[in-house]
Interface confidence: low
């Protein structure tokens, strides 16, 4: 804590200017008016204060705004933002996207800190949903942002926001997350024509059900193997050899290289060897000719 001492004669700050960098900590405490500091926060960033001096300035703002800083101050915090604790940020009410951008810019190039995490949480909660502009901003700064959200949090993303999502934003999403995002993407892109639709929906297909994959197989989409390998195993298993051949088009040759990996391995085990042989890829492990395939799950449902 900085002791309360009287400001030396002639040192009372009239402006936030570069002369303040020569002030000792106690002089900053005594000579800088907190209200002045609040109105001139934009100048603080242009002055090379030491970390210790910034601590004093933060302390002054904390005293002025014990319930949390107003947005007019928050927007101009600049590097002082790095001095804030998550506890401080939990008191804020940030509603402007410009404020959010300004603070994310300060942290640019670094891992997401709990300060930033708390800021984003406060901002999104304040808006009530993850709208397109917010998502655009967050994924620009943190490409992994979307995949860090829980399925419950993703359920608040409106379909209109899906337009802001780039393929790389989904790189680290797991199947549970894609299960939530895929129906939203399907809705968002529903009015596009076949080939354009496939380009947009491709990154989300890890959440697609069997019936949608069957429909895509009728549209000459030529899905690449990387996308196919990310599909849900339970969605791939019911596809016939002919449907997979149509779905992959010229990429069907890639199945051979992936025959030991899911979902290809499990899919092969469900196909008749006769049908697999028609692909001419030498895929092995299908159901031998003459064997009867019983769908036990169907039997159980009937009994």
């Amino acid at each position: 804590e900085v002791e309360k001492t009287a400001c030396p004669s002639g040192k009372k700050a009239r402006e936030i200017d570069e002369s303040l960098i020569f002030y000792k900590k106690w002089e900053l405490e005594a000579c800088v008016d907190a209200a002045l500091l609040a109105t001139q926060m934009d100048r603080v960033n242009a002055i090379p204060f030491t970390y210790e001096q910034l601590d004093v300035l933060k302390h002054k703002l904390d005293e002025l705004y014990p319930q949390g800083y107003p947005e007019s101050v928050i927007q101009h915090l600049g590097y002082l933002f790095l001095k804030m604790s998550p506890e401080d940020i939990r008191k804020w009410n940030v509603t402007s996207l410009e404020t959010l951008k300004a603070l994310l810019e300060v942290n640019k190039g670094h891992e997401m800190s709990p300060q930033v995490a708390t800021l984003i949480d406060r901002f999104v909660k304040g808006r009530g949903q993850l709208d397109k502009d917010t998502l655009d901003t967050l994924t620009a700064f943190y490409p992994g942002y979307l995949c860090s959200l829980s399925p419950e949090e993703l359920s608040s993303v409106p379909p209109s926001s899906i337009w802001a999502v780039r393929p790389q934003d989904l790189d680290t999403c797991d199947p549970r997350q894609l299960d939530v995002l895929y129906p939203k993407a399907r809705l968002a892109f529903q009015n596009m024509n076949g080939s354009e639709y496939f380009v947009k929906i491709q990154s989300f297909l890890g959440g697609a059900p069997t019936e949608d994959l069957k429909a895509l197989s009728q549209q000459n989409v030529s899905m690449d193997l990387a996308t196919f390998m990310k599909l849900r195993t339970d969605a791939v298993l019911p596809l016939t050899v002919a449907e997979v051949q149509k779905l992959l088009g010229p990429h069907v040759e890639g199945l051979k290289a992936e025959e030991r990996h899911r979902p290809v391995r499990d899919w092969i085990l469900r196909q008749r060897q006769d049908d697999l042989d028609t692909l001419g890829l030498g895929l092995q492990g299908g159901i031998p000719n003459g064997y009867l395939v019983l769908d036990l799950s169907m039997q159980e449902a009937l009994s």
Epitope: R90, M112, S113, P114, T118, D121, S150, E153
Partner: antibody, heavy 123, light 112 residues
Framework: QVQLKQSGPGLVQPSQSLSITCTVS????????VHWVRQSPGKGLEWLGV???????DYNAAFISRLSISKDNSKSQVFFKMNSLQADDTAMYYC?????????????????WGQGTSVTVSS | DVVMTQTPLSLPVSLGDQASISCRSS???????????LHWYLQKPGQSPKLLIY???NRFSGVPDRFSGSGSGTDFTLKISRVEAEDLGVYFC?????????FGGGTKLEIK
């Protein structure tokens, strides 16, 4: 995996200071805060303070005059120093990570703890 | 400081029984924007505490679903639906809504 390893003396003379280092692995101090908590039979679990990822600190007012927490992000180390120890400071001292995912809501619980440093204050 | 009061001090149970521990705070733990930062920890003999439940009712990763938390405001409960031998130890509630963070005195779960 997430680990916090503590190193420090077991025996401290009365009126001397206690220094403990908490070396973390499996996560970055740029992204997570670290709390310090102590446990004694007489007083149970007591929260002493925290250093947040950005380097700012919050201390329990009862200890603020003799407690200092700092860190070196590049070495993944957090440093705890308490001055003027007396017999009633005898306790097990723990460092613990401030819990939460990097991006979604932080939950401000201590999700991973160090093994503890048993400190006896005696001459 | 916020005082956390746990009851009972000791809870003898038979394996397979349900156990219930209560925690009461001296002031509301609802944070200014709605979250309630009340957590539960288990400490086994000779070990560090381990997080079980965070923010009233969320199980930490790896915690079995026989553990559940509930409550609001100032009154909170931890329930174990079917006690197993590995659940024995001292349970602590803790709040992190207000600084300083504070802990309850602990409840020892032991075999009847």
């Amino acid at each position: 995996q997430v680990q916090l390893k503590q190193s420090g003396p077991g025996l401290v003379q009365p009126s001397q200071s206690l220094s403990i280092t908490c070396t973390v692995s499996g996560f970055s101090l740029f992204s997570y805060g670290v709390h310090w908590v102590r446990q004694s039979p007489g007083k149970g679990l007591e929260w002493l303070g925290v250093i947040w990822s950005g380097g700012s600190t919050d201390y329990n007012a009862a200890f603020i005059s003799r407690l200092s927490i700092s860190k070196d992000n590049s070495k993944s180390q957090v440093f705890f120093k308490m001055n003027s120890l007396q017999a009633d400071d005898t306790a097990m001292y723990y460092c613990a990570r401030n819990g939460g995912s990097m991006i979604t809501t932080l939950y401000y619980a201590m999700d991973y703890w160090g093994q503890g440093t048993s400190v006896t204050v005696s001459s | 400081d916020v005082v956390m009061t746990q009851t009972p001090l000791s809870l003898p149970v038979s394996l397979g029984d349900q156990a219930s521990i209560s925690c009461r705070s001296s002031q509301s733990l609802v944070h200014s924007y709605g979250n309630t930062y009340l957590h539960w920890y288990l400490q086994k003999p000779g070990q560090s505490p381990k997080l079980l439940i965070y923010k009233v009712s969320n199980r930490f990763s790896g915690v079995p679903d026989r553990f559940s938390g509930s409550g609001s405001g100032t009154d909170f409960t931890l329930k174990i639906s079917r006690v197993e031998a590995e659940d024995l130890g001292v349970y602590f509630c803790s709040q992190s809504t207000h600084i300083p963070f504070t802990f309850g005195g602990g409840t020892k779960l032991e075999i009847k």
